[in-house]
Interface confidence: medium
């Protein structure tokens, strides 16, 4: 009975050649969507010269299918029962399930000028920078196309710069052909309460983006756990895109196609300031635009960023603190469209449904030499997009996996 | 078309009180800051003061701090400017001004002249006993 | 303080350029006056927008700390002051320049 089910499930989640768990593993039979929405700038001109809050109004979705590529370099280690893969990122514009084109003009914060003005504090050197910004007819904001604000674009002011420095900018550039990794986690063989749990990432087993424990990678990469998860668990996980480990705790019970799912959801604990939760104090790096660590709800990961002041929330400031949503207009959080959840089956441990949200914002202040920079009178964490990242179970997979699995122990 | 019209000017007394109306028309008033500047016979164009579209943000001339006060009337369409404790030196052309923005400025101490896209006629105020 | 000069001249048909100095890299707005007291047009806003009723000819740049109206093909109904309009965010003053008297020969 119960023995054979659980010895059955020890050994499919293996991840190694011949289980079920290694064939899904390698590549996602789930289709996986990343939907984009783009915070239009409504008043770029009224922002630039009175520093008034920003309008802002947003536009999508924009739909991508995402992570249909197998993971590559796949490299059993036998000897410390880990598994290391590459995986590579690609996006195919899905214009059935998205609002418009990626010739879509969107107004936007100048993502190279803020970037800039950031990086290179130094009064002398801003005079110069305020030069080139002028010539190169560059402003706060400027107008880009969907694919050139997220896959990249030659930026004019970046290009007069007289030194090697990289003029194409883009959210997500570069992105396609390219792979995240290298990963190496272990395979389960040993131990199947270990399975899918990273060991290292890019050959280290800490981020050496924050300090102490907040360095360390923890748990899976999210698209499953170890097998028999309990509801008072913390499930841990690793995302890359946030460049931190985050947690997620039991929400509910969720019917999915027949399958029965734990739904987990990341806490608003997780996005908290260190005032109310001590444990986040490590993921302050700054004490200026965290009001002395007293904001919460954003994240800043420029350190992960080449010192681009990327500030990453969930959508539409959800959890965030008003301080720094009070300089944004058109804003309306809300639990269920911006929360990330994750829905998995407690038997395999296996995540047959989620979504995972998340906003991605950048930092502007006031620069008096920079002209396009020197009338704002306070600092903006300006939202440029969020998006909704989705995956579930299709039907074919949800009738075998009640068959084989929730079937048999029912 | 954007119209601005001034009204209120005048023979006033030095030491009293004067009331200029600005009534505008042709846009929609409640999305656009005003304010009024001011000229002197043969002189050049002084600032005054300025009100942010919801009536926030208000902003006075050096030369006036403390004896003007600016207001508006979104449901009229209507900004007003009183000014007391009359002195020669408040004799001229009073200029209604429209900003192309819904605020003059934020949390600064002063309006932008540069940020001016529509004026009125103007209305002549003399001080004088 | 706002320097720009007191008079230019130019024939019709020609380019003229007033200049407008401030403290620091700034925006400007130019405003025409036909005669003393009399009403006031914005003719650019912000250095470089034009109201939709103002001719092509006329244009607005910056240079630094400097700011520049140019009229293209100046006409007879051109003559005028222009004062020129900024605000230092430095320092949080507005300023209006003394005005450049437009004479078309």
């Known amino acids: 009975g119960d023995m054979l089910i659980q010895k059955t499930i020890k050994k499919e989640v293996v991840l190694e050649e011949g289980t079920i768990a290694f064939k899904n593993w390698v590549k996602t039979g789930t289709e996986i969507y990343r939907q984009f929405w783009i915070f239009d700038v409504q008043n770029p001109q009224e922002v630039m010269m009175n520093s008034s809050n920003i309008q802002v109004k947003q536009r999508g979705p924009y739909t991508y299918r995402v992570r249909f590529l197998a993971k590559e370099n796949i490299t059993q280690d036998p000897k410390d029962n880990t598994v290391s893969f590459l995986q590579p990122n690609g996006a195919i514009f899905e214009p059935s399930l998205s609002v418009g084109t990626e010739a879509d003009n969107f107004t936007v914060l100048n993502l190279a000028v803020a970037a800039a003005s950031h990086i290179y504090p130094n009064p002398f050197v801003q005079v110069v920078l305020n030069s080139l910004i002028n010539k190169s007819k560059s402003s706060m904001f400027q107008v880009r196309t969907l694919r050139e604000l997220l896959w990249g674009y030659t930026d004019p002011f970046l290009s007069l710069v007289p030194y090697p420095v990289s003029t194409r900018v883009g959210m997500f550039y570069p992105y396609n052909n390219t792979a995240d990794g290298v990963y190496k986690v272990f395979n389960g063989k040993d131990s199947i309460s270990k399975v899918a749990i990273i060991d290292t990432y890019k050959g280290k087993r800490n981020l050496s983006y924050w300090e102490s424990y907040c360095d360390m990678i923890n748990g899976t990469d999210a698209a499953s756990f170890p097998p028999f998860v309990e509801k008072s668990q913390v499930l841990q996980f690793f995302s890359s895109d946030i460049c931190r480990s985050i947690y997620a705790v039991f929400e509910s019970d969720v019917n999915l196609k027949g399958i029965p799912v734990y739904r987990f959801v990341l806490p608003s604990k997780a996005f908290a300031s260190p005032v109310q939760n001590p444990d986040n104090h490590c993921f302050c790096t700054e004490k200026i635009i965290s009001k002395n660590c007293t904001s919460y709800g954003v994240l800043d990961i420029s350190k992960c960023k080449e010192g681009k002041p990327v500030y990453i929330s969930l959508p539409h400031f959800l959890y965030a603190s008003p301080d720094v949503s009070e300089t944004i207009d058109g804003l309306n959080p809300n639990e269920e469209e911006h929360r990330t959840y994750l829905d998995i089956e407690p038997i395999t441990g296996f995540t047959l449904q989620f979504a995972k949200r998340l906003q991605v914002n950048l930092l502007v202040k006031p620069s008096n030499k920079i002209q396009v920079l020197k009338r704002l009178k306070r600092n903006y964490i300006v939202p440029i997009l969020w998006l909704n990242e989705t995956g579930t179970i299709g039907d074919e997979k949800a009738k075998m996996f009640r068959s084989q699995v929730t079937g048999k122990i029912n | 078309a954007v119209t601005l019209d001034e009204s209120g000017g005048g023979l006033q007394t030095p030491g009293g009180a004067l009331s200029l109306v600005c009534k505008a028309s042709?846009?929609?008033?409640?999305?656009?800051?005003m304010g009024w500047v001011r000229q002197a016979p043969g002189k050049g164009l002084e600032w005054v003061a300025g009100k942010a579209k919801d009536g926030g943000g208000t902003a006075y001339g050096s030369a006036v701090k403390g004896r003007a006060t600016i207001s508006r009337d979104n449901g009229q369409s209507t900004v007003r400017l009183q000014l007391s404790n009359l002195r020669a030196e408040d004799t001229g052309v009073y200029y209604c001004?429209?900003?192309?923005?819904?605020?003059?400025?934020?949390?600064?101490?002063?309006?932008?002249?540069?940020?001016?896209?529509?004026w009125g006629h103007g209305t002549e105020v003399i001080v004088s006993s | 303080a706002l320097t720009q000069p007191s008079s230019v001249s130019a024939s019709p048909g020609e380019t003229v350029k007033i200049t407008c100095s401030g403290s620091?890299?700034?925006?400007y707005g130019w405003y025409q006056q036909k005669s003393p007291g009399s009403a006031l047009v914005t003719v650019i806003y912000d250095s470089t927008n034009r109201p939709s009723s103002i001719p092509s000819r006329f244009s607005g740049s910056t240079s630094g700390s400097t700011g520049t109206l140019t009229i293209t093909g100046v006409r007879a109904d051109d003559e005028a002051v222009y004062f020129c309009?900024?605000?230092?965010?430095?320092?949080?003053?507005?300023?209006f320049g003394a005005g450049t008297t437009l004479t078309v020969l």
């Open positions: 309009g900024s605000f230092d965010s430095s320092t949080d003053s507005t300023a």
């Open positions: 001004a429209k900003s192309a923005y819904g605020d003059w400025f934020y949390g600064s101490s002063g309006p932008y002249a540069d940020s001016i896209d529509a």
């Open positions: 042709g846009f929609d008033f409640s999305s656009y800051a």
């Open positions: 620091s890299d700034s925006w």
